[in-house]
């Protein structure tokens, strides 16, 4: 068990703060909830603190919750591939470029670390080149979320990882908006981290609303499990 992994044996409170600017539309989001890495479970509620969110909530899911991949459930035989927990408590910087097919792009940068007993995800997001009446600024996405696989590989040169995946957002007319994600994570501290073999995270997310919440918001339930590495030969012959 890495030192960081010991911090995730129970339920951990999560705080998310995001400041965004998409095509000059500025907004802030605050999120609170908890994570339980034993089950790979996240429960979070996000509120736009600046009024109405100028982009669809589903376009921010990866920035919020795929930002705290340290809550992913890594099976026993894969624990030595869990970069995310090993970087704690100092944490990691997570940078992404997200290309929305036939539309603009988000550039995000987050610092994910423990502050006391709380796991904090602080994010800056800059979006450019979006069409004012496209699927994103035109709010044409359905309020739901598909399951995805998130592919992880070591980046030895930067003592971190590189991550690639394609998100499929459902559009109201029945078609799909693709969002290509290019991600890199580097540790904030200078302690040792686990550099993984290639594997993936299997994610399932459910979006809902709080009937008592008047502000623009999103409630998120998510389950994430690591997969893609089989038991070693010594395991097979036990």
């Amino acid at each position: 068990m890495s030192k960081g992994e010991e911090l995730f044996t129970g339920v951990v409170p999560i705080l998310v703060e995001l400041d965004g600017d998409v095509n000059g539309h500025k907004f802030s989001v605050s999120g609170e909830g908890e994570g339980d890495a034993t089950y790979g479970k996240l429960t979070l509620k996000f509120i736009c603190t600046t009024g109405k969110l100028p982009v669809p909530w589903p376009t921010l899911v990866t920035t919020f919750s795929y930002g705290v991949q340290c809550f992913s459930r890594y099976p026993d035989h894969m624990k030595q591939h869990d970069f995310f927990k090993s970087a704690m408590p100092e944490g990691y910087v997570q940078e992404r470029t997200i290309f929305f097919k036939d539309d603009g792009n988000y550039k995000t940068r987050a610092e994910v670390k423990f502050e006391g007993d709380t796991l904090v995800n602080r994010i800056e997001l800059k979006g450019i080149d979006f069409k004012e009446d496209g699927n994103i600024l035109g709010h044409k996405l359905e309020y739901n979320y598909n399951s995805h696989n998130v592919y992880i590989m070591a980046d030895k040169q930067k003592n971190g990882i590189k991550v690639n995946f394609k998100i499929r957002h459902n559009i109201e007319d029945g078609s799909v908006q693709l969002a290509d994600h290019y991600q890199q994570n580097t540790p904030i501290g200078d302690g040792p981290v686990l550099l993984p073999d290639n594997h993936y995270l299997s994610t399932q997310s459910a979006l809902s609303k709080d009937p008592n919440e008047k502000r623009d918001h999103m409630v998120l339930l998510e389950f994430v499990t690591a997969a893609g590495i089989t038991h070693g030969m010594d395991e097979l012959y036990k």
Epitope: D19, D21, T50, K107, T108, R122
Partner: nanobody
């Protein structure tokens, strides 16, 4: 806050802004740049005021720490394990908005007058 120091030594720079520079949403990015003789001005570190998120050039990562006191409107740069190649004139700079897209000197409209840091071997 500049000065002369032996290689391996430490220095702390500070920069006080006379007014709060921000956009209409109260967002503000402050950074440190440096310029060695005959070279272009280069980014050292920057900090986004509202969230406290920080950015560092690869050459100073793990040695330098940027911080700010929002109440005093003051920016700091703590420098450890200094090397002769850190010798330069150091400038603080500020701009309203996010930090994520403020990478080059031309992104910053407000500048301090600069302080000399000399590291001898």
């Amino acid at each position: 806050g500049g000065g002369s120091v032996q290689a391996g030594g430490s220095l702390r720079l500070s920069c006080a802004a006379s007014g709060y520079i921000s956009d209409s949403h109260g967002r503000n990015c402050m950074g440190w740049f440096r310029q060695a003789p005959g070279k272009e001005r280069e980014a050292v570190a920057r900090i986004y005021s509202r969230l406290g998120t920080t950015y560092y050039a690869d050459s100073v990562k793990g040695r330098f720490t940027i911080s700010r006191d929002n109440a005093k409107n003051t920016l700091y740069l703590q420098m450890h394990s200094l090397k002769p190649e850190d010798t330069a004139m150091y400038y603080c700079a500020a701009v309203g908005g996010l930090c994520i897209d403020k990478e080059t000197p031309t992104d910053y409209p407000f500048w301090g007058q600069g302080t000399q840091v000399t590291v001898s071997s």
